[in-house]
């Protein structure tokens, strides 16, 4: 069971300092941006991180949403990352959900975050280069020191 708590507005970056944004095709991508670029590209660079209380404490349970014309929420259904047009729900009556991720700091580095899927144990949000694009993907990872699964989250509130 997950119950919604508060939400915050955040900019998410990979460890190469590329900014996560949602492109015109609703794809989550990373790109080099100045602070000015980041502001100019809002709201596509501003993510709503909603925190949830968890009936089985396993870290901070969150959803990641973005509000462009409508609110879309990040999902890892079938291990594929996509934004689905939906508001983060107030309650989820299950111990797993395709839209819930556990946000945890990397041990010894409070500013570096990992996001583990609640649906797929050992699968993490990651940045992966595909041709010329840096994509947000779900990655099965047993190399927990891999920088591709680490992010910084900067609060914009």
């Amino acid at each position: 069971y997950f119950g919604k708590l508060e939400s915050k507005l955040s900019v998410i970056r990979n460890l190469n300092d590329q900014v996560l944004f949602i492109d015109q095709g609703n794809r989550p991508l990373f790109e080099d941006m100045t602070d000015s670029d980041c502001r100019d590209n809002a709201p596509r660079t501003i993510f709503i991180i909603s925190m949830y209380k968890d009936s089985q404490p396993r870290g901070m349970a969150v959803t990641i949403s973005v509000k462009c014309e409508k609110i879309s929420t990040l999902s890892c259904e079938n291990k594929i990352i996509s934004f689905k047009e939906m508001n983060p729900p107030d309650n989820i009556k299950d111990t797993k959900s395709d839209i819930i991720f556990f946000q945890r700091s990397v041990p010894g580095h409070d500013n570096k975050m990992q996001f583990e899927s609640s649906s797929y144990e050992g699968y993490f949000l990651a940045c992966e280069k595909e041709r010329d694009l840096f994509k947000l993907i779900l990655k099965k990872e047993d190399e927990l020191g891999d920088r591709s699964i680490m992010f910084t989250v900067q609060n914009e509130d």
Epitope: R58, F102, V106, P107, E121, L144, G145
Partner: antibody
Framework: QVQLVQSGAEVKKPGASVKVSCKVS????????FHWVRQAPGKGLEWMGR????????KYAERFKDRVTMTEDTSTDTAYMELSSLRSEDTAVYYC???????????????????WGQGTLVTVSS | DIQMTQSPSSVSASVGDRVTITCLAS??????LTWYQQKPGKAPKLLIY???KLQDGVPSRFSGSGSGTDFTLTISSLQPEDFATYYC?????????FGQGTKLEIK
């Protein structure tokens, strides 16, 4: 309690290949990997590589990648490690071990080699 | 590759002594470090994971500390069954690498 049972000792000639098996007995959760570690007589532990039983993907240590093949048979819960072009320096005890997530009180994951096989002595001698 | 430098390579101590073994990583491995105990002819046994978390069933005289590049295994009061070889292992990145081992001998 998970137990790993390995195949018996082998004596091989230089240039030959050896295939060591590792069978899981007992309940094991999903989301584990098999790793192989070797130990030459009187020496330390050396990581050789790992296989993911979910998709058979492997990662090998650079020094073994041209000679080692790790496979897994999900139907029998058995992992295999084959080492080819054997030389005398490959004389060692070969261990299989499971690599699984342990968690701290905040749910943070750590991968751990927890269950180990009893070891298989491979002797390479002409 | 990440190098793990373990010291000392051997140490002589008596029952009741406090013993400290260190492992130094060549780069930041966060706390993705485990400690193992190995006795002659046996497979390694997990003692500590996550640099400082005691594995179930391991006596509380064993403790681990450290983060980043510097790690320590401490045995607060040596017991006869503790004489063995100890290894650290970094699990941060492949290839996984072990320390060279520390042989703990009876003085």
């Amino acid at each position: 309690q998970v137990q790993l049972v390995q195949s018996g000792a082998e004596v091989k000639k230089p240039g030959a290949s050896v295939k060591v098996s590792c069978k899981v007995s007992g309940e094991i959760s999903t989301g584990y990997y098999f790793h192989w570690v070797r130990q030459a007589p009187g020496k330390g532990l050396e990581w050789m590589g790992r296989i993911d039983p979910e998709d058979d993907s492997t990662k090998y240590a650079e020094r073994f990648k041209d000679r080692v093949t790790m496979t897994e048979d999900t139907s029998t819960d058995t992992a295999y490690m084959e080492l080819s072009s054997l030389r005398s320096e490959d004389t060692a005890v070969y261990y299989c071990t499971t690599w699984r997530i342990y968690r701290d009180s905040s749910g943070r994951p750590f991968y751990v080699m927890d269950a180990w096989g009893q070891g298989t002595l491979v002797t390479v001698s002409s | 590759d990440i190098q793990m430098t373990q010291s000392p390579s051997s140490v002589s101590a008596s029952v009741g002594d406090r013993v400290t073994i260190t492992c130094l990583a060549s780069e930041d491995i966060y706390t993705y470090l485990t400690w193992y105990q190995q006795k002659p002819g046996k497979a390694p046994k997990l003692l500590i994971y996550g640099a400082n978390k005691l594995q179930d069933g391991v006596p509380s005289r064993f403790s681990g500390s450290g983060s980043g590049t510097d790690f320590t295994l401490t045995i607060s009061s040596l017991q006869p069954e503790d004489f063995a070889t100890y290894y650290c292992l970094q699990g941060s990145k492949f290839p996984l690498t072990f320390g060279q081992g520390t042989k703990l001998e009876i003085k």
